[in-house]
């Protein structure tokens, strides 16, 4: 029976979501509770490490939300963004694979605001490379496992 | 070893983004630089041709952006849309497989605006059929390779 | 030749879209017309039943639209949301796998409004489990087959 193909579906660790409106690399994801799972890949300090060369489908879903009971939003005009980043360790370098998001005016009369971003794409990844997620306005992240997650699954070998 | 399955990840050719606010078929994509790649499929005049029957997962990510330094937007109320289109050459016809987008009011006080669309789906494609991308307001497209791209990978054979 | 892997791409049944602005489980999808198709999975009362254990990629694309000619929107501040729900029949329970959406103010001067949501993720599904789609404001759903659909395809076996 062929070796199981690598995959991961990682959900946000609600307890470690940073506050602030700066852009940040999210450092803590669950890999073994609820819908989160990982196989033949490695998770370390928020980065998903590739252990097996291949072509992978990568995806991320990021939800932002704000309720007036938690105070005013950090800014009238928000940039709610996600970046899926590939880091090569051998030659220390980081490159954006995918980005998505929207500028939002959340200063209105509504007491609740919500916005989700989804990105996905097919990429060649080499063993040792790492995938991480950067977001703006991390204090607005929705901590639910169905809301803020990212993942990967290997589709085929290289060559 | 089984023949490598067809795939493509195509990124926008920034040098050939059309101007205007009309709906247009994007005619120039990279297939061999940066994250862009293609195998067992063909790119011709902006259309991704299927060479091998199969069930494919198709996806597109389209980012729009505007900074006030580049002048005013075409209209206060924008329709920022993407259509993933299948064209059959034998019986000349085009059909929308997927669409996504949003109406936006970018006339506000913010000097920068951004919005991304992501669509994806699983489709039966026959050799000779072609996939293309139509967008509204092409002059607002984000030309970065992580922003505006589309792709496909074969998941399984037909029958 | 190995058995064909399970998949489904289901498009909204325009004739049975419910009215109202409440959250509802969509109960009628096409499985055999236009782009809609299904294999080794079962559709029953709007729920997509898994017949074969495995890891599946699930996705949904939901479009909302409103034209002033069809009257005013239910409320100035809309929550346009989708939830992809897994139901286990053995132990009757439902859990959200994915969610996405946005709050929107569609009370503006534009005569047409549009918004799309896309979500996707990789999940372990067991035979007998069912996938369904819940949306808010169903009366605003776009009934086109390229607009409102969901699907799944099996990527690999469990173990």
């Amino acid at each position: 029976k062929p070796e199981a193909q690598p995959f991961a579906h990682l959900t946000i660790n609600a307890a470690s979501i940073p506050s602030g409106s700066h852009k940040v690399t999210l450092s803590s994801w669950y890999h073994d509770r609820g819908w989160a799972k990982i196989s033949n890949m490695t998770l370390s300090n928020g980065k998903l490490r590739v252990n097996q060369d291949g072509f992978y489908y990568l995806y991320a879903n990021i939800c932002f939300r704000h309720h007036e009971t938690s105070g005013s939003v950090p800014t009238d005009y928000l940039q709610l963004m996600v970046y899926v980043v590939k880091t090569s360790i051998k030659i220390p370098s980081s490159h954006n694979l995918m980005k998505g998001g929207s500028t939002k005016n959340w200063s209105g009369n509504s007491e609740f605001h919500f916005y989700s971003i989804n990105v996905g794409g097919f990429f060649k990844l080499r063993a040792g490379e790492e995938i991480s997620i950067q977001v703006s306005n991390p204090s607005l992240l929705d901590p639910d496992q169905d809301a803020t997650y990212f993942g990967a699954f290997k589709v085929q070998d290289i060559d | 070893k089984p023949e490598a399955q067809p795939f493509a990840h195509l990124t926008i050719n920034a040098a050939s983004i059309p101007s205007g606010s009309h709906k247009v078929t994007l005619s120039s994509w990279y297939h061999d630089r940066g994250w862009a790649k293609i195998s067992n499929m063909t790119l011709s005049n902006g259309k991704l041709r299927v060479n091998q029957d199969g069930f494919y997962y198709l996806y597109a990510n389209i980012c729009f952006r505007h900074h006030e330094t580049s002048g005013s937007v075409p209209t206060d109320y924008l329709q920022l849309m993407v259509y993933v289109v299948k064209t059959s050459i034998k019986i000349p016809s085009s059909h929308n497989l997927m669409k996504g987008g949003s109406t936006k009011n970018w006339s506000g006080n913010s000097e920068f605006h951004f919005y991304s669309i992501n669509v994806g789906g699983f489709f039966k494609l026959r050799a000779g059929e072609e996939i293309s991308i139509q967008v509204s307001n092409p002059s607002l497209l984000d030309p970065d390779q992580d922003a505006t791209y589309f792709g496909a990978f074969k998941v399984q054979d037909i029958d | 030749k190995p058995e064909a892997q399970p998949f489904a791409h289901l498009t909204i049944n325009a004739a049975s879209i419910p009215s109202g602005s409440h959250k509802v489980t969509l109960s009628s999808w096409y499985h055999d017309r236009g782009w809609a198709k299904i294999s080794n999975m079962t559709l029953s009362n709007g729920k997509l039943r898994v017949n074969q254990d495995g890891f599946y990629y699930l996705y949904a694309n939901i479009c909302f639209r409103h034209h002033e000619t069809s009257g005013s929107v239910p409320t100035d501040y809309l929550q346009l949301m989708v939830y992809v729900v897994k139901t286990s029949i053995k132990i009757p329970s439902s859990h959200n796998l994915m969610k996405g959406g946005s709050t929107k103010n569609w009370s503006g001067n534009s005569e047409f409004h549009f918004y799309s949501i896309n979500v996707g993720g990789f999940f372990k599904l067991r035979a007998g489990e069912e996938i369904s789609i819940q949306v808010s404001n169903p009366s605003l759903l776009d009934p086109d087959q390229d607009a409102t659909y969901f699907g799944a395809f099996k990527v690999q076996d469990i173990d």
């Epitope: 470690s16 940073p18 506050s19 602030g20 409106s21 700066h22 852009k23 940040v24 690399t25 999210l26 450092s27 803590s28 300090n45 928020g46 980065k47 950090p74 800014t75 009238d76 005009y77 940039q79 963004m81 880091t87 220390p92 980081s94 991480s132 703006s136 991390p138 204090s139 | 913010s110 000097e111 920068f112 | -």
Partner: antibody, heavy 116, light 108 residues
Framework: QSVKESGGGLVTPGGTLTLTCTVS????????MSWVRQTPGKGLEWIGY?????SPYYANWAKGRFTISRTSTTVDLKMTSLTTEDTATYFC?????????????WGPGTLVAVSL | DMIQTPASVEVVVGGTVTFNCQAS??????LAWYQQKPGQPPKLLIY???TLASGVPSRFKGSGSGTQFTFTISDVECTDAATYYC????????????FGGGTEVVVK
Amino acid sequence: QSVKESGGGLVTPGGTLTLTCTVSGFSLSRNAMSWVRQTPGKGLEWIGYIYSGSSPYYANWAKGRFTISRTSTTVDLKMTSLTTEDTATYFCARHVSDGGWYLDIWGPGTLVAVSL
Amino acid sequence: DMIQTPASVEVVVGGTVTFNCQASQNIGSNLAWYQQKPGQPPKLLIYSASTLASGVPSRFKGSGSGTQFTFTISDVECTDAATYYCQQAYSISNVDNAFGGGTEVVVK
């Protein structure tokens, strides 16, 4: 691209002082700004930051006595109830353009002395 | 919040020096290193734990993630004499100071 602080000087304990950071060559709508101070012979102390049009964020110790605000070309730091321990060089620094909390352009600093 | 060790270190010209920064919580790779010489403002050397800022020589290297970070200068030059600070760039909540206490590098 440059940053310059002004408004420093001698102030008596209990007093109020407002420092101004003036930027040139870049837009405050695209870059956040931080205030950082350095007491004589000591290390750097982050005070707070402000993003475009945003409510500012502060270090725990700075909440209440320090207020950051901005216009299109300046960022102000208002300090109240000053004590001798607030004697320091105050720096204004630009965040990198991609929005990260990394400070890539610093002003030369302005000295604030709190003394009777 | 951020603990730097040692407070001071001596190194000979052409040598290599390494020092550390420890975060009180997992900050992933959200860490910067700055160099400050007397009478000057700090200068950004490294961000995202290991990425060199523009114009910074490759003699400077950052590594680590999570809570443990390391900064290394190889082929030390006289002009490297300065105080070096780490800064967490992860979360502003409950921050007393985003910066470490600094490490003074004395070049012999």
